[in-house]
């Protein structure tokens, strides 16, 4: 059995960012499991004093696109589209710096979802990054052109 499937997003937690677009899942039954994890994480985030407004504004859509990545329509096999590295780095190092420090000391804060690791993402100028999912972090354009 091949690994990886493209299926319509059927959840609620990330519907405002993803709608019913096709997302990549490692296994057929994973969408429901991750939906539960994300719902629980968002509930915790909503009651947390560790999350600033400037962070949550972009961290929440970013987490949604990380947990439920769009399928790469240009690929002949099921393949996820990655977050954009420049946005990931700004989120981690600028907008959510304090939150990331807290989260890194609690590796399973997102339950069975790993914290996004910007180092895993292709470099901005590489061909692999051409189709990355852009959240729309305003500072990312500035960061992208000056590094």
């Amino acid at each position: 059995e091949e690994d990886g499937f493209c299926q319509p997003y059927r959840g609620i937690a990330c519907a405002r960012f993803i709608g019913n677009r096709t997302v990549y899942m490692e296994s057929l039954h994973m969408q429901g499991e991750i939906e539960n994890q994300i719902t629980a994480a968002f509930t915790m985030i909503g009651t947390s004093s560790h999350l600033s407004d400037k962070c949550s504004q972009f961290a929440i859509p970013s987490l949604c696109h990380y947990a439920f990545p769009y399928c790469d329509e240009t690929s002949s096999v099921p393949k996820p589209r990655d977050l954009c590295r420049d946005e990931c780095e700004i989120l981690e190092n600028v907008l959510c710096q304090t939150e990331y420090i807290f989260a890194r000391s609690n590796p399973m804060i997102l339950m069975r979802l790993k914290l996004p690791n910007c180092e895993d993402l292709p470099q901005p100028e590489s061909p692999e990054a051409a189709n990355c999912i852009r959240i729309g972090i305003p500072m990312a354009d500035h960061h992208h052109h000056h590094h």
Epitope: Y66, D82, L113
Partner: antibody
């Protein structure tokens, strides 16, 4: 079917080099970490290091740092373990295994292993 | 690095016996512990993940549990094909670390 197949093992002299390959099929390695784990004869499992093929970022065990290099060719869906300055204590069966990049998961698929013998 | 202390290192048992293997983590690893079975000349096979979840295709006689930093693998009724070496592993942080292994032999 998901499969990992190692190759490249053999007999090498101390101080020598060897390159192992881990060919993946049934899944795209860019969505995973590919780990190398070794097992000395009659001993337990020891983690060697891993690569995130998507970006090329790597992590190594202290025992091999500076001597071993992990790389990947995503077009061939294959990861590699380049072993230099080999020592007798590097003698082991070397396995590659995969681990999800997104999810907290153990190593769900392993290769069959390839034996590396370091001896004069 | 997180140490995983596994015990016993070996045990003798008969077919039908209930077998328990334990692993203690040197620090909190939440539920990020897996158990593997390895037979001579073969690669390890995943049995249990996230401390207590049975991996696909693994017989239900295998089960896992957690109590704080103590993790247990139980084989409810040992079968002839279960004689092998068992390893625990934490994958909570890098580097992932393994227990020393428990060899289950025929009495």
């Amino acid at each position: 079917e998901v499969q990992l197949v190692e190759s490249g093992g053999g007999l090498v002299q101390p101080g020598g080099s060897l390159r192992l390959s881990c060919a993946a099929s049934g899944f795209n390695i860019t969505g995973y970490y590919i780990h190398w784990v070794r097992q000395a004869p009659g001993k337990g499992l020891e983690w060697v290091g891993y690569i995130s093929p998507n970006s090329g970022s790597t992590y190594y065990a202290d025992s091999v740092k500076g001597r071993f290099t992990i790389s990947a060719d995503t077009s061939k869906n294959t990861a590699y373990l380049q072993m230099n300055s080999l020592r007798a204590e590097d003698t082991a069966v070397y396995y590659c295994a995969r681990d999800s990049r997104r999810y907290v998961r153990p190593f769900d698929y392993w290769g069959q292993g390839t034996l590396v013998t370091v001896s004069s | 690095d997180i140490q995983m202390t596994q015990s016993p290192s070996s045990l003798s048992a008969s077919v039908g016996d209930r077998v328990t293997i334990t692993c203690r983590a040197s620090q909190d690893v939440n539920t990020a512990v897996a158990w593997y079975q390895q037979k001579p000349g073969k690669a390890p096979k995943l049995l249990i993940y996230s401390a207590s979840f049975l991996y696909s295709g693994v017989p239900s006689r295998f089960s896992g549990s957690r109590s704080g930093t103590d993790f247990t693998l139980t084989i409810s009724s040992l079968q002839p094909e279960d004689f092998a070496t068992y390893y625990c592993q934490q994958h909570y942080t890098t580097p992932p670390t393994f227990g020393q292994g428990t060899k289950v032999e025929i009495k």
